[in-house]
């Protein structure tokens, strides 16, 4: 008679996350007596999933009756498979001996390979706002997947991204994976409403990739212009001065005003206009006294914006009968004191 | 590169419970079986278990009864404990990582650390 | 267990010249996947072994190619076709299909 064979018909087999997975097996002979099992990877270091004489093995049934009268049918289900389950599954023949059973034949093998869906990318951008014209980095992760092969893209404002690194781990054999991508991105001045995305595309999402966003709103600086101007008044003795603070972002604004260096007033910024870029607005006023000077006043609106360093802008108000509308106005960056260079009239 | 590095007593009275512990640096112990074989003085080399990463264990039977192989994946660190020690488990003692793939099983145990030498004696 | 026995037990050789050992296995090392469980490993003189070969016949990263191994089942070859002054140490052959891993006896290459 022929000597048995033990026949796995199905090289792979590839099954979704979660679902069951049924891996087929027979025997070409009812001898020699003995037990059937069946072990994940070969070798010294297989794993037994099912054995037919005893144990308990709570997600494994088999496809047909065991016990039936001249069964040759050993195959198995194996339920809720999760990418810890993916190998080389192999149905293994055993003779019956003494004291233990001796391994007959074993069928050629099927790998499970298990399809696995990436979770949702998380995209995070730099700790620290930069300035436009500065590169910023945005990183983008998904992890348990499986398959390894995974496509992802960067696109800002919908426009794709060609800046970018991407790594898949692990680099060798694994149940599942994770990928991580940096993207590195020009800021420009009208980013305060830019978004970047990550989209990542996998066989697992069948052509509907996962995307994972950041807003720029959250990685950016814009530093505030500043213009301090002096407007008409009908007292001869009394001076408006104001401080337009521009295009800033974010609102984070603290402006102090400075006569001749010292602090006549500090104020946050509370009510802003917004621009249609998401840039900020705002303006302040200081009415000076000239009859409490009997020289020349200079100025300062002086700007702390986002915890940066101050930059300020002072104005030159000329104390003099005939000239109460002239002045001269200096830009400069202030120090951590408070007082600032007095510029000269021009 | 990854690298393995033992560590224990030098010395361990007879009777007594010899420990060693294996760290791996430069690499992860996913996806590996983590090995201890052992070689007394001008002798060959002897299995004494391994260990996979998900904590699945595997021991030389003529050992078995006094072995235990433990791991711990946040020190990235695995340990080898032998009771009832006697001066014929004196001996230079390797761990090692072993490749494995699903599919294949075992192929190659590719890196060793240097060596660790514990003598039994009173 | 599987028994590994390994010949000779030692074997002086000269530079340049080649040199082959033999391992034999108590039982086939070939599984039903067509590989077989073999692997060997060179221990030079103070230090850890070094993987060689694995599965029979497959060259380990970073093993110059002057070594190769060949067999099937229970019969197994190691061959260094130019011996080095560096070859010198003790190679093992050490089966990887059941547990316990056993390794042969070792075969000690030396320079005549």
């Known amino acids: 008679e022929d000597e048995l064979q033990v026949i796995q018909p199905e090289k792979s087999v590839s099954v979704a996350a979660g679902e069951s997975a049924t891996l087929r097996c027979a025997m070409t002979s009812l001898i020699p007596v003995g037990p059937i099992m069946w072990f994940r990877g070969a070798g010294a270091g297989r794993e037994l999933i099912y054995n037919q004489k005893e144990g308990h093995f709570p997600r494994v049934t088999t496809v047909s009756e065991l016990t039936k009268r001249n069964n040759l049918d050993f195959s198995i289900s194996i339920s809720n498979i999760t990418p810890a389950d993916a190998g080389t599954y192999y149905c293994v023949k055993f003779r019956k001996g003494s004291p233990d059973d001796v391994e007959f034949k074993s069928g050629a093998g099927t790998e499970l390979s298990v399809r696995a869906k990436p979770s949702a990318p998380v995209v995070s951008g730099p700790a620290v706002r930069a300035t436009p014209e500065h590169t910023v980095s945005f990183t983008c992760e998904s992890h348990g997947f499986s398959p390894r092969d995974i496509t992802l893209k960067w696109f800002k404002n919908g426009n794709e991204l060609s800046d970018f690194q991407t790594n898949v781990d692990p680099a060798g054999d694994s149940v599942s994976y994770s990928i991580h991508s940096t993207a590195r991105v020009v800021l420009t001045r009208g980013d305060v409403h830019s978004q970047v995305i990550c989209e990542i595309a996998h066989i697992t999402l069948q052509g509907d990739p996962l995307r994972g966003t950041a807003n720029l709103s959250e990685a950016i600086r814009v530093p505030p212009t500043l213009e301090v101007t002096q407007q008409p008044m009908r007292a001869e003795n009394q001076a408006n001065v104001t401080c337009q603070v521009s295009n800033f972002y974010p609102r984070g604004l603290q402006l102090t005003w400075l006569e001749n260096g010292n602090v006549s007033r500090t104020e946050t910024a509370s009510t802003l206009i917004e621009n249609k870029d998401g840039t900020y607005n705002w303006m302040s006023w200081l009415l000076v006294n000239t009859c409490a000077h009997r020289d020349d006043v200079v100025l300062t609106c002086q700007v702390e914006h986002d915890g940066q360093q101050a930059v300020s802008k002072s104005y030159a108000l000329e104390i003099s009968a005939h000239q109460k509308e002239h002045g001269s106005d200096i830009t400069h960056e202030a120090a951590l004191a408070p007082t600032a260079p007095l510029g000269g009239s021009g | 590169q990854v690298q393995l590095q033992e560590s224990g007593p030098g010395l361990v009275r007879p009777s007594e419970t010899l420990s060693l512990t294996c760290t791996v640096s430069?690499?992860?112990?996913?996806?590996?079986?983590w090995s201890w074989i052992r070689q007394p003085p001008g002798k060959g080399l002897e299995w004494i278990g391994f260990?996979?990463?998900?904590?699945?264990?595997f021991y030389n039977s003529s050992l078995k009864s006094r072995v235990t192989i433990s791991l711990d994946m946040s020190m990235n660190q695995f340990s080898l404990k032998m009771t009832s020690v006697t001066a014929a488990d004196t001996a230079v003692y390797y761990c090692?990582?072993?490749?494995?793939?699903?599919?294949?099983?075992?192929?190659?145990?590719?890196?060793w650390g240097q060596g660790t030498t514990v003598t039994v004696s009173s | 267990d599987i028994v590994m026995t390994q010949s000779p037990l030692s074997l002086p050789v000269t530079p340049g010249e080649p040199a082959s050992i033999s391992c034999k296995s108590s039982q086939s090392l070939l599984y039903s996947n067509g590989y077989n469980y073999l692997d060997w490993y060179l221990q030079r003189p103070g230090q850890s072994p070094q993987l060689l070969i694995y599965?029979?016949?497959n060259r380990a990263s970073g093993v110059p190619d002057r070594f190769s191994g060949s067999g099937s089942g229970t019969d197994f070859t190691l061959k260094i076709s130019r011996v080095e002054a560096e070859d010198v140490g003790v190679f093992y052959c050490?089966?990887?299909?059941?547990?316990?891993?056993?390794f042969g006896g070792g075969t000690k290459v030396e320079i005549k």
């Open positions: 599965l029979g016949s």
């Open positions: 260990i996979y990463y998900n904590g699945r264990t």
């Open positions: 090692a990582r072993v490749r494995a793939y699903s599919g294949i099983g075992l192929d190659g145990t590719d890196v």
């Open positions: 430069g690499g992860s112990i996913r996806n590996y079986y």
């Open positions: 050490m089966q990887a299909l059941q547990t316990p891993l056993t």
